[in-house]
Amino acid sequence: MAFAPIPRITWEHREVHLVQFHEPDIYNYSALLLSEDKDTLYIGAREAVFAVNALNISEKQHEVYWKVSEDKKAKCAEKGKSKQTECLNYIRVLQPLSATSLYVCGTNAFQPACDHLNLTSFKFLGKNEDGKGRCPFDPAHSYTSVMVDGELYSGTSYNFLGSEPIISRNSSHSPLRTEYAIPWLNEPSFVFADVIRKSPDSPDGEDDRVYFFFTEVSVEYEFVFRVLIPRIARVCKGDQGGLRTLQKKWTSFLKARLICSRPDSGLVFNVLRDVFVLRSPGLKVPVFYALFTPQLNNVGLSAVCAYNLSTAEEVFSHGKYMQSTTVEQSHTKWVRYNGPVPKPRPGACIDSEARAANYTSSLNLPDKTLQFVKDHPLMDDSVTPIDNRPRLIKKDVNYTQIVVDRTQALDGTVYDVMFVSTDRGALHKAISLEHAVHIIEETQLFQDFEPVQTLLLSSKKGNRFVYAGSNSGVVQAPLAFCGKHGTCEDCVLARDPYCAWSPPTATCVALHQTESPSRGLIQEMSGDASVCPDKSKGSYRQHFFKHGGTAELKCSQKSNLARVFWKFQNGVLKAESPKYGLMGRKNLLIFNLSEGDSGVYQCLSEERVKNKTVFQVVAKHVLEVKVVPKPVVAPTLSVVQTEGSRIATKVLVASTQGSSPPTPAVQATSSGAITLPPKPAPTGTSCEPKIVINTVPQLHSEKTMYLKSSDNR
C-alpha cells in the first residue's frame, strides 16, 4: 500500500464557514459531550464547563466554573508543580449520569475530584467525591473514561506521581480495579474506552463488555530501548471480582496486541493515538478505527487501521495466552503457553454456559481460573486489521484524532468516511476508493495551527457536524463543503460521497440535506466528469493596465492534484523567458505588457483520476490592446501560497488547440516564477495602450475538453 496522496483540496480557515466557540482566559477545551436529543454540546475546559447550541456552537447556553482555591493551589505548588498551569482544575471526565445530570471530574490541583452537574440549574451539587482512579492527578497524564449504566469505567493513573496505572469501575455495590502489576499494565498511555453491548439476539446470555485502548511498554519484546505496544483490553460489565483470589479486582481483564503495519515493508505503527468505534445499522458487529504513529516518528508518519470487533473477541475467547519465564538476573521473558487452560476459561464473561455449570457470578469461579487470569492477562494472539493492512498511511503529517462516518453514495455504495485531525489544527477527510486512499479535502480548523485534542461527530440525520476541541477553543464544521464546488466537474472530481451535482439548480448539494429525491443528481465516485452537462459561457470583466506593466491572469483551480498550464492564441507557451511568470502556482503573470500580448489566454488543468486524465478549461482571458490617453494602473494582486497544499510550483506548458494532451510541466525555479520564450516584439507605438482583459469568471467555462485513458505516469 502506497502513502496516501495529498488532500485534493485545501480549505483555508477563512475560506469556509466554520463556527467557533471560545471564552476569554479559558483554555484546554478537551472534553466534549454531545446530547443529540437536546441539540446541546457540553464542553469541559480548564476550570469551566459550558453548554452550547450544537447546531451553532457560538451560542452559549450555560456556563459553570470549578476553580481551585488559593489554598489548594499553594499546597500543589509546594509539591513542585506550576501554580499558573498545573495547579488548576482541568476537566477530564465529562460523562452523562442521567437525563438531568452529568458526572464531571477534574485534576483539581493534583487532588482529583468529581461532582454531579445538574443540567437544569447548571450548577454543581457540591459532592466533591474523591476522583482518585477516575481522573488523573496530573493534567499531562493520559486518561479515558466511559459511563456504563450509571457506573464510571476509567483508565488513568492512581497516584500523584502517575506511576500507578489503573483501570477501574467506580460502583457503589461492586467497585473493581486492575492488579498493580507489570503484566497487567506497564506504563500505559490511555487512549479510549467504550462499551460494546451484547447483541439483542445473542443466544448465549452474553455480557456487555467494556473495551480499553492504550499504548504501553512491551513486556514481550526485548530490545535495547523500550518498545511500545498498542493494546486492546477488555473487561466484562457483570464482573464482580473474585471471592478470595482477585477480590475487588477484575476477573475478566484480558489484553492483546493491536497490529497495524505495512506488510510489504518494515513499517510498524506501534503508538496508538485515538480510536473510534463505528456502529451502523448495516454492521452486525462494530468496526473500530484506530489511529497510529510509529514509535520513532522523525518523518511524520501516521496510519489508520480498521478492525472487526469480532476479531478481538475471538482472540479473547479462543486465543492462546502468554506466560512469563524468569531468565538470568531476574529478567522476565514472555512466551506462548500451549498447555491446557483451566475451566471455566480464564477471563471469560459469565454466560449461560457458565451459569449452567453453576458459575452464576465471578465470585463463584474456581481459584485455578482466577489465579490463571491473574498470572496471564496477556494474550499471545494479536488483533489483526481488516484486510491485514492499514486503511491509510500518510507521510509528513501527525494525526491526532479520528472519527468515522458510514455513508451511502448515490449508487448505493457504502463508504466509511474518515475525519482525521492533525497536530497543526487541520482536518483531513478521507475515503478508501478501490484499495487506494482519496483525501477529499483538508480544512484548516484552527488559525493558529494548534493541535486538535478532541474530535466528535454528530450522528443525528440532517444537520451533521464535526466538532473539534483544542487548547484555544472549539470549532464546528459541516461534514462537507459541497456548495464550494462551483461547477459540475468540480463537484464530481471532489469524489465526496456527501456531495452531488444538481443540474436544475446548477449547484453542488449535500446529499443528506436534500429533502427531494436524488433522481437527476449527478455523482460519480470514479471521478468521471464526462457525465456533466455542457455549460454556457460566463460573462466578461475588464481590467486596465499600464503599457510596460504587469498583468496577472487568474486561474482559480482549487485542486491540489491538478496541474495547471496556459495556452496563448492556441500556441504553446514555452518555458524560457522573463516574459511570463507564475504566481501562487496557478495565476499567469505577463511582464512588460505590449500590443503583442493581445489575444486569448486559456488556463487549463490536467487531473489524473484513476487511469484517466481529465482536462478542463478553468479560465479564459481575452487581452485587447487599445490606445488610451491616460493609463489606469491596475491594483496589485497578492497571491498567498495555500498552506498545506504541498505541491511544488509547476512551470507552464501549453499545447495547440485540440492536440494531444500537453507535455508534463517542468519544475519551477525556487522563486516560484517561471520563464517562457520571448515572442516577437510588436511594432511599437508612441502612445500607451489600454489593455482590456475580457475575463470569463474563474469557473470552468467549458465542458471537459477530453477524458483520456493514459499510460502509467
Epitope: Q323, S324, T325, T326, V327, K333, Y337, N338, G339, P340, V341, P342, K343, A357, D367, K368, T369, Q371, F372, D375, H376
Partner: antibody, heavy 117, light 108 residues
C-alpha cells in the same frame, strides 16, 4: 468425593493392541482436562497425552504419537487410552490423572500392562 | 523438550533433619507451572506443591517449595518416617509436559 477408577491389569502379546479405561466420579469430565502418564518398572514418570473431553481436543508427547490414542466418552464420564503395536518397551503402569493450573490433583490407581509372548 | 534434572538422585536422612531437593530445568520455565509430587512404592503419585510454592490440600506444613526460572527446590522442614518416598518435580510450562528424574528419599 473425586475418584478415578482405572480398568484392571492387562497381559498382551507383542504387536497386539490394548484399550485402558478410566471412569471418574465426583466431577464431570467435560469440566476438566484428562491425562495419561506412563511409569515403567523402577523408572520415572512420563506424560503421554491429554484430552479436553468437552471438545475432544488432544495433545500428545511426540514419542507417543502413533502409539497412543486418547479418547473420552462424556456420557459415561470415562477416558480411554488405546496402545497399539505393543512391544516390551510398553510394559508399564499407566495412570490417568486430572487437573491443570493446580497441578495433577487427582490420580487413578494405575493399570499394569505387561507385554509378553 | 524441557529436561528436569533432580539432585540428589538418592538420599538418606534421619527424622527431624531438614531436607532440600533441587530441580534444574534445561530452559527457563514459568514458576506458575512447576509442581512437586510424592510417590510411595506401589502407590499413585500424590500432588504435594503446585505452582512452585502452594501447598496442596492435606499436605503437612513441613513441606515447602520455592524457585524461579531454571532453579526450583522442595524443602522438608523436619523429616518424618512417613516422608520416605520418591519425589518428582513436573513442568507444564511447555509441551510436552515433563517430569524430573526423581529423588529417592530413604530413612537413615
Amino acid at each position: 468425593e473425586v475418584q478415578l477408577q482405572q480398568s484392571g491389569a492387562e497381559l498382551v502379546r507383542p504387536g497386539a493392541s490394548v484399550k485402558l479405561s478410566c471412569t471418574t466420579s465426583g466431577f464431570n469430565i467435560k469440566d476438566e482436562h484428562m491425562y495419561w502418564v506412563k511409569q515403567r518398572p523402577e523408572q520415572g514418570l512420563e506424560w503421554i497425552a491429554w484430552i479436553d473431553p468437552e471438545n475432544d481436543n488432544t495433545e500428545y508427547a511426540s514419542k507417543f504419537q502413533g502409539k497412543a490414542t486418547i479418547t473420552a466418552d462424556t456420557s459415561s464420564n470415562t477416558v480411554y487410552l488405546q496402545l497399539s503395536n505393543l512391544t516390551s518397551e510398553d510394559t508399564a503402569v499407566y495412570f490417568c490423572t486430572t487437573g491443570d493450573y493446580d497441578g495433577f490433583t487427582y490420580w487413578g490407581q494405575g493399570t499394569l500392562v505387561t507385554v509378553s509372548a | 523438550e524441557i529436561v528436569l534434572t533432580q539432585s540428589p538422585t538418592t538420599m538418606a536422612a534421619s527424622p527431624g533433619e531438614k531436607i532440600t531437593i533441587t530441580c534444574s530445568a534445561s530452559s527457563s520455565i514459568s514458576s506458575n507451572f512447576l509442581h512437586w509430587f510424592q510417590q510411595k512404592p506401589r502407590f499413585s503419585p500424590k500432588l504435594l506443591i503446585y505452582r512452585t510454592s502452594n501447598l496442596a490440600s492435606g499436605v503437612p506444613a513441613r513441606f515447602s517449595g520455592s524457585g524461579s526460572g531454571t532453579s526450583y527446590s522442595l524443602t522438608i522442614g523436619t523429616m518424618e518416617a512417613e516422608d520416605v518416598a520418591t519425589y518428582y518435580c513436573q513442568q507444564g510450562s511447555f509441551m510436552p509436559f515433563t517430569f524430573g528424574t526423581g529423588t529417592k528419599l530413604e530413612l537413615k
